[in-house]
Interface confidence: low
């Protein structure tokens, strides 16, 4: 168990011409917030695949309003760290995705509007318990500076937070800097002493005397930036033309570790630290079983025919893929009505409505009935961008303000006489006809072609139409 921590130092326009002056649109002030997403391994995963190691959302930053003619500043950022707790082992290799979101605070129908401003993706190797790693990334015209680290919690130790130390109930007999560690009940374990001179900032060790380098650093003491000239290398023969030391082949050159394993040099050889689900000298053996928890997003893992076998994931609604790693594109169902723009934010769907529409799915037409009243008991019907009134009987017109003569359309058939009534109209039928509109002839024998008139109602009596 442990926590991944991300500290955003600055976000602003990158160097060079064409850099944006402001993150806000012309509609007014805005504020920024960040989303961090962690995915296991070093894979080129699809952007929409879930954050299997976890995700976190920052608070909203201070409101920013563009100052005309002022130099474009680094933008005001939310306070505090972004923290992503992890429950299982820290995988060592991971993909880090940082998204910068803009929240527009202008007069938006249906609340503030969100839009993704920048997204950076880094595939990294990182040991838990190491120092902060710093990074600068460009995303389009924006530049993001940040630091990150993984640290163990809840008595876990080691670069993967897999070894558990438990405090003794009895007072410790060990000196300062030593920690009691299970299962060594009566002994104490010192944090390993790294190779002399191993960079405190860029190196770490699990075993005494070793010096493993963090991403971007190299050399036996992790003091050489990986991108610098090989003249600073410390291995291999000298080159007569440059006076440089030309690096000779090292055990980890070409990374012999397969499947995203990380390589560390041992005297005359190498050692692979394999990601979960792989083992073997070079992490070449794919041994993923249900015990490894390969099904993401609550998928049900079904094993094969024996404990050593592969697995099949049965995915819950909303997810697909062999590991339930892909979220079904809920926007493909077009849930936003009236031309609204669908945004799948992961935790929820959001519809950005066109002007004149509102509601969770843009189902309300604000132009239709807002502030419009239908007179004389009429009801307003939305649709088509213009309101329409459904009028009570006896009224008509756009707003039901006009009196309507229910008898004007001559509704009584076969010479029946029409009378206007408070609740509609009444037809007085001519002899030989019956029905609410005098539509049914009465046969000479007194039996109609349809079922007989109700008791007490004789043909020719007026029948009120309700």
């Amino acid at each position: 168990a442990g926590v991944f921590e991300l500290q955003i130092h600055s976000f602003g326009p990158g160097p060079g011409p064409g850099a944006p002056r402001s993150p806000c649109s012309a509609r007014g002030p805005c504020r920024l917030f960040f989303r961090v997403c962690l995915k296991p391994g070093l894979s080129e995963e699809a952007a929409e695949s879930p954050c299997a190691l976890g995700a976190a959302l920052s608070a909203r930053g201070p409101v920013y309003t563009e100052q005309p003619e002022a130099p474009a500043p680094d933008l005001p950022l939310p306070n505090g760290l972004l923290q992503v707790p992890f429950r299982d082992a820290w995988p060592g290799t991971f993909s880090l995705i940082i998204e910068t979101w803009r929240e527009e605070l202008g007069d938006q129908i249906g609340g503030p509007a969100w839009s993704l401003l920048a997204r950076v993706t880094r595939r990294r190797r990182l040991a838990a318990g190491g120092p902060w790693a710093r990074d600068i990334q460009r995303a389009g015209a924006w530049e993001l500076r940040f630091s990150y680290r993984a640290r163990c919690e809840l008595l876990a130790v080691g670069t993967a937070c897999t070894r558990l130390c438990r405090p003794r109930s009895a007072p410790s007999r060990c000196g300062p800097g030593l920690r009691p560690c299970a299962p060594l009940e009566d002994e104490c374990e010192a944090p390993p002493v790294c190779r002399a001179g191993c960079s405190l900032e860029h190196g770490f060790c699990e075993q005494p005397g070793e010096c493993r380098c963090l991403e971007g650093w190299t050399g036996p003491l992790c003091t050489v930036p990986a991108s610098t000239s090989s003249c600073l290398g410390l291995r291999g023969p000298s080159s007569a033309t440059t006076g440089c030391l030309v690096p000779g082949p090292g055990p980890c050159d070409g990374n012999p570790c397969a499947n995203g394993g990380s390589c560390s040099e041992t005297p005359g050889s190498f050692e692979c630290t394999c990601p979960r689900g792989f083992y073997g000298l070079r992490c070449e053996v794919s041994g993923v079983t249900c015990a490894d928890g390969p099904c993401f997003n609550g998928g049900l893992c079904v094993g094969g025919a024996d404990p050593d076998s592969a697995y099949i994931c049965h995915c819950p609604p909303g997810f697909q893929g062999s590991n339930c790693e892909k979220r079904v594109d809920r926007c493909s169902l077009q849930p936003c009505r009236n031309g609204g723009l669908c945004l799948d934010l992961g935790h929820a769907l959001r519809c950005r409505c066109r002007a004149g529409f509102a509601g969770p799915r843009c189902e309300h037409n604000l132009d239709d009935c807002a502030g419009r009243a239908c007179a004389n008991g009429g009801t307003c019907v939305e649709g088509g961008g213009a309101h329409r009134c459904s009028c009570a009987l006896g009224f008509g017109g756009r707003d039901c303000r006009e009196r309507a003569d229910p008898c004007a359309a001559r509704p009584c058939a076969h010479g029946g006489r029409c009378y206007a009534h408070f609740s509609g109209l009444v037809c007085a039928c001519a002899p030989g006809y019956m029905g609410s509109r005098c539509e049914f002839p009465v046969h000479p024998d007194g039996v109609s072609a349809l079922p007989a008139a109700p008791p007490g109602l004789r043909p020719g009596d007026p029948q009120r139409y309700l």
């Epitope: 080129e44 499947n259 792989f278 070449e284 053996v285 794919s286 590991n323």
Partner: nanobody, 117 residues
């Protein structure tokens, strides 16, 4: 696009043998290939699997009778099935597991194996 083409299925008497082949194409970063089977009315189950390095495992019911092998140059995996019995009847599916994190499974269309007594 990953494609798997199975061949070699058919009908055989109990005690007989068959050799299934599965040719794969259109992928990178192969981790392992496998044969699964599904008997009528039953769940699909793993029969055997082989990793790129040659590591194999088998279902308990086929150990000693079935042998999985591969030809990496031809991107093909084989399942040699000996001492077949009626319980081995079913659809046999080839599967390939690929990707840097071995998280993507692709399946063939399946091939029918029928063992009569």
């Amino acid at each position: 696009q990953v494609q798997l083409v199975e061949s070699g299925g058919g009908s055989v008497q109990a005690g007989g043998s068959l050799r299934l082949s599965c040719a794969a194409s259109g992928y990178t970063d192969r981790c392992s290939m496998a044969w699964y089977r599904q008997a009528p009315g039953k769940e699909r189950e793993l029969v055997s699997r082989i990793s790129t390095s040659g590591f194999t495992n088998y279902a308990a019911s086929v150990k000693g009778r079935f042998t999985i092998s591969q030809d990496n140059a031809k991107n093909t995996v084989y399942l040699q099935m000996n001492s077949l019995n009626p319980g081995d009847t079913g659809m046999y599916y080839c599967a390939i597991i690929v990707g840097r994190t071995c998280s993507l499974n692709y399946w063939g269309n399946g091939i029918l194996v029928t063992v009569s007594s």
